[in-house]
């Protein structure tokens, strides 16, 4: 009786079980009554990650320079290369086949985490007692400036976007 | 038990040609992918061909792609190497080579080797 | 297509471990996990040691151990044996159209 299903690495084909190539090799030829499966190692720039029936093996993928990309991890006989972006630049998605220039906080806004080659920088706004008054991809949120520390007294409030303005204290109040 | 036999070695004159035969026993030799192995004397090994287990799939060095073929009688039990244009950088011991499974890019098993000389 | 490196000779004394290095290229080593070693004893056949980088075939004592790392293969012998004097040959698939290439072999010599 022929089998209707195969074992686990085991692929069913002219009603035979034939070994699976493993990752890393092509099928040449499904085995037979006689003969074991054959298989290939992929060549050069080539690929397969599991083990496989493919008659061809899938290319690297290219780290294209013009696109912003650069080689994170070469690839191997058994894994795809991993593209990663230029410094300044991060991936528009999780296969990164594109790169964008990281996003710049706005004033009020501070740098909450810093962009990497794989995320875009993270804002948040500056809470109540801290400004940012720059356009930057780093900075975070400064403390406002403490007047008391210095002697001196606050003349102008701060907001998210300023610093406040220390004076001296007016000499005539007792 | 396995064993391979190689046999057909000898002197050749150089642009010559000889055949060697490996006779297989112990194992469903149709199964296995074989190669073949050669030492030049006094030095390392150098693989020179390989065949799968049918036949149909054959692969060669470089150093012999042209000038040798090899095939297999699986009815025989037997790998062949056709040598054909044979140079002096040709002489050495050649191994039969079991491949490990499908894989001849492993040899789990050899023969005890067939001098090949090439010399005038 | 050039052989992968070994050193030409190693040494140890019994029950020491020794390492045998075997580099080569991302086209050889580096891209492919098909990295076997070969003991070959004066005037005698090649005998697997080690297939697919660290896998040993039945019959083959534990004390032979395989490992890689980038394009570096490394044999290790721990528990050194008289028997383990033999030259050895590392031997990997590589994507140039000569498809096997061996290392040149390193003689390992046990002291004493």
């Known amino acids: 009786e022929p089998p209707t299903a195969c074992r686990e690495k085991q692929y069913l084909i002219n009603s035979q079980c034939c070994s699976l190539c493993q990752p890393g090799q092509k099928l040449v030829s499904d085995c037979t009554e006689f003969t074991e499966t054959e298989c290939l190692p992929c060549g050069e720039s080539e690929f397969l990650d599991t083990w496989n029936r493919e008659t061809r093996c899938h290319q690297h993928k290219y780290c294209d320079p013009n696109l912003g990309l650069r080689v994170q991890q070469k690839g191997t006989s058994e894994t795809d290369t991993i593209c990663t972006c230029e410094e300044g630049l991060h991936c528009t998605s999780e296969s990164c086949e594109s790169c964008v220039p990281h996003r710049s906080c706005l004033p009020g806004f501070g740098v909450k985490q810093i962009a990497t080659g794989v995320s875009d920088t993270i804002c948040e706004p500056c809470p109540v007692g801290f400004f940012s008054n720059v356009s930057s991809a780093f900075e975070k949120c400064r403390p406002w400036t403490s007047c008391e520390t210095k002697d001196l007294v606050v003349q102008q409030a701060g907001t998210n976007k300023t610093d406040v303005v220390c004076g001296p204290q007016d000499r005539q109040r007792a | 038990e396995v064993q391979l036999l190689e046999s057909g070695g000898g002197l050749v004159q150089p642009g010559g040609s000889l055949r060697l035969s490996c006779a297989a026993s112990?194992?469903?030799?149709?199964?296995?992918?074989m190669s073949w192995v050669r030492q030049a004397p006094g030095k390392g090994l150098e693989w020179v061909s390989a065949?799968?287990?049918?036949?149909?799939?054959?692969y060669y060095a470089d150093s012999v792609k042209g000038r040798f073929t090899i095939s297999r009688d699986n009815s025989k039990n037997t790998l062949y190497l056709q040598m054909n244009s044979l140079r002096a950088e040709d002489t050495a011991v050649y191994y039969c080579?079991?491949?490990?499974?499908?894989?001849?890019?492993?040899?789990?098993?050899w023969g005890q080797g067939t001098l090949v000389t090439v010399s005038s | 297509q050039s052989a992968l490196t070994q050193p030409a000779s190693v040494s140890g004394s019994p029950g020491q471990s020794i390492t045998i290095s075997c580099t080569g290229t991302s086209s050889d080593v580096g891209n492919y996990n098909l990295v076997s070693w070969y003991q070959q004893h004066p005037g005698k056949a090649p005998k697997l040691m080690i297939f697919e980088v660290n896998q040993r075939p039945s019959g083959v004592s534990n004390r032979f151990s395989g490992s890689k790392s980038g394009t570096t293969a490394s044999l290790t012998i721990s528990g050194l044996q008289a028997a383990d004097e033999a030259d050895y040959f590392c031997c990997s698939y590589t994507t140039s159209s000569t498809y096997v290439i061996f290392g040149g072999g390193t003689k390992l010599t046990v002291l004493g």
């Open positions: 065949t799968g287990g049918s036949g149909i799939s054959t």
């Open positions: 080579a079991r491949g490990y499974s499908n894989s001849w890019w492993y040899f789990d098993y």
């Open positions: 112990g194992f469903t030799f149709s199964r296995n992918a």
